[in-house]
């Protein structure tokens, strides 16, 4: 074999409807290019159940499987699945042959292949078709929400899927509202979850050849009524130079719909507080949590007058929470001068 020669399935067109089961022997160091479907509708290539990325030394790209230089770890089972389905278009095993340096130059490269189109589909143990969609293993959802677990798989014969909860068969008969099992989507759906739905959910995918399983852990958060929670340390004390831009950040967590305001503390008639004991404030920004970037207060081209105390105030039907920070503004001409913020620079308070 010449070093430049590639192992290639010709032509690079859509395969016949019958699945191609093939075994190819590839010399170490040899480039490989295998095709599956027309370029614009090419299938997705998987190695041992993991989808190949479109970039890298071994890549699946526009229906092509490309290996720059075949290495021992590249040997194994490769599958091409039709886009948008789990139909196996190509099913082949790459086997490591001799390295190019020791290969027999008289050998016909085609003798490395078994391209017979078998009419009987080969049996295959179940495997995950989209493991990247199963990456989120730990789920925590508020009570009343809908939960959907998916375990997309394939195999031959087509596997069956069943679900366990905490190791026991789970059909949802004891669950108010039951469950929805969508076998064609390999999914379990539970609507309006409650604390008793907490547990370990296992999908068990089986066929005559083998079985695989995957666990999801579910926690259900009880909607205990509470005022908004503000992330500690935000907004943060900030120092800026005259003319610069400043961003103050406030992170709000709330089950009930929260309402957020940004306030600046001001002085009226020489006093910071009114007769009622509350501070004088100016409302700079107000909105609900769904508004774009309401949790950020932008101050453009700051001047000395912008220095002072700023408060993020969040309220819901249960109560109010607020945290404050100080903005210190330094003059451009004398960067050595610093305005000292009060000792207790960052406050956080809760009001019922």
């Amino acid at each position: 074999l010449e070093a430049s020669e590639e192992v290639e399935l010709e032509p690079c067109l859509a395969p016949s409807l019958e699945q191609q089961e093939q075994e190819l022997t590839v010399a170490l160091g040899q480039p490989v290019r295998l095709c599956c479907g027309r370029a614009e509708r090419g299938g997705h290539w998987y190695k041992e159940g993991s989808r190949l990325a479109p970039a890298g030394r071994v890549r699946g790209w526009r229906g092509r499987l490309e290996i720059a230089s075949f290495l021992p770890e590249d040997a194994g089972r490769y599958l091409c699945l039709a886009r948008g389905s789990m139909i196996v278009l190509q099913n082949l095993t790459l086997i490591t042959g001799d390295s190019l340096t020791s290969s027999n130059d008289d050998e016909d490269p085609k003798s490395h292949r078994d391209l017979s189109n078998r009419h009987s589909y080969p049996q295959q143990a179940p495997y995950w078709t989209h493991p990247q969609r199963m990456e989120k293993k730990l789920h925590a959802v508020p009570a009343g929400n809908t939960v959907k677990f998916r375990c997309p798989a394939a195999g031959n014969p087509t596997p069956t899927i069943r679900w366990l909860k905490d190791g026991q068969a789970f059909h949802g008969e004891n669950r108010i509202g039951g469950i929805r099992l969508r076998h064609q989507h390999w999914s379990l759906v539970m609507e309006s979850v409650v604390p008793s739905d907490r547990g370990t959910y296992t999908c068990l995918v089986e066929n005559a050849v083998g079985s695989i399983r995957y666990n999801y852990l579910l926690d259900v958060l009880e909607r205990s009524p509470h005022r908004p929670i503000l992330q500690a340390g935000l907004p943060a004390n900030t120092t800026a130079v005259v003319g610069s831009d400043v961003e103050l950040l406030c992170k709000v967590y709330s089950d009930a719909q929260p309402h957020i305001q940004w306030l600046k503390h001001i002085v009226i008639n020489g006093s910071s507080f009114g007769a009622d004991g509350f501070p004088y404030v100016q409302v700079l920004k107000t909105a609900d949590i769904n508004s774009s970037e309401v949790e950020v207060l932008y101050l453009r081209n700051v001047s000395a007058e912008d220095a002072g105390e700023y408060t993020c105030l969040a309220g819901n039907s249960i109560g109010l929470s607020y945290q404050s920070a100080w903005l210190t503004v330094l003059p451009e001409e004398d960067p050595t001068w610093t305005a000292a913020a009060p000792e207790a620079a960052s406050h956080h308070h809760h009001h019922h």
């Epitope: 041992e48 989120k136 293993k137 852990l217 579910l218 009880e222």
Partner: antibody, heavy 119, light 112 residues
Amino acid sequence: EVQLLESGGGLVQPGGSLRLSCAASGFTFSTYWMAWVRQAPGKGLEWVSVIGPSGGMTVYADSVKGRFTISRDNSKNTLYLQMNSLRAEDTAVYYCARINSGSSHFDYWGQGTLVTVSS
Amino acid sequence: QSVLTQPPSASGTPGQGVTISCSGSSSNIGSNSVNWYQQLPGAAPKLLIYSNNLRPSGVPARFSGSKSGTSASLAISGLRSEDEADYYCAAWDDGLDAYVVFGGGTKLTVLG
């Protein structure tokens, strides 16, 4: 800045009990899964237990099941590990770790607290 | 006996590259992503690689991870003396219970 600070370790006799604490700061504790991982002297890491944000969902390693209890107090931003019926093989540095909510790895670890079980 | 198998030791000289392997089974690495942790002498473990091949911010590009089937590997290029540490692979395991399994750890020595 995310910080996890374990405490409560010490010397205890076989059969005794100990309660470890992990004070969390710099993140919204009540929204994260948390875990305990231990490391016996000169040995590798061993996962001990995991707990959901509500505190109502817990999982344990077989080696501690029935003896250890993981819990949390979200109002105090604190994770706990109650260890009962302690054995010599429980001697280890115990780390608390935050679990990343996206891909379920331990993204932040505490500095650890040493538990020694010996008579 | 760790569920994931790692070589107990590895070594290299400064500037060299080294690869640490981690072998598992279909119930752990085969079904779940692999994470790598670095433990410097006397310190707590620190996340090095997550989701097979992703680096947290602050981890140099010299560290890279990969996974194929039921095995994973951590590659370190351009070795530096500060890379001398224990390295652990980990993954969730979907056996009869859900739990996390670790490799036994690989002690990396940077020679000279």
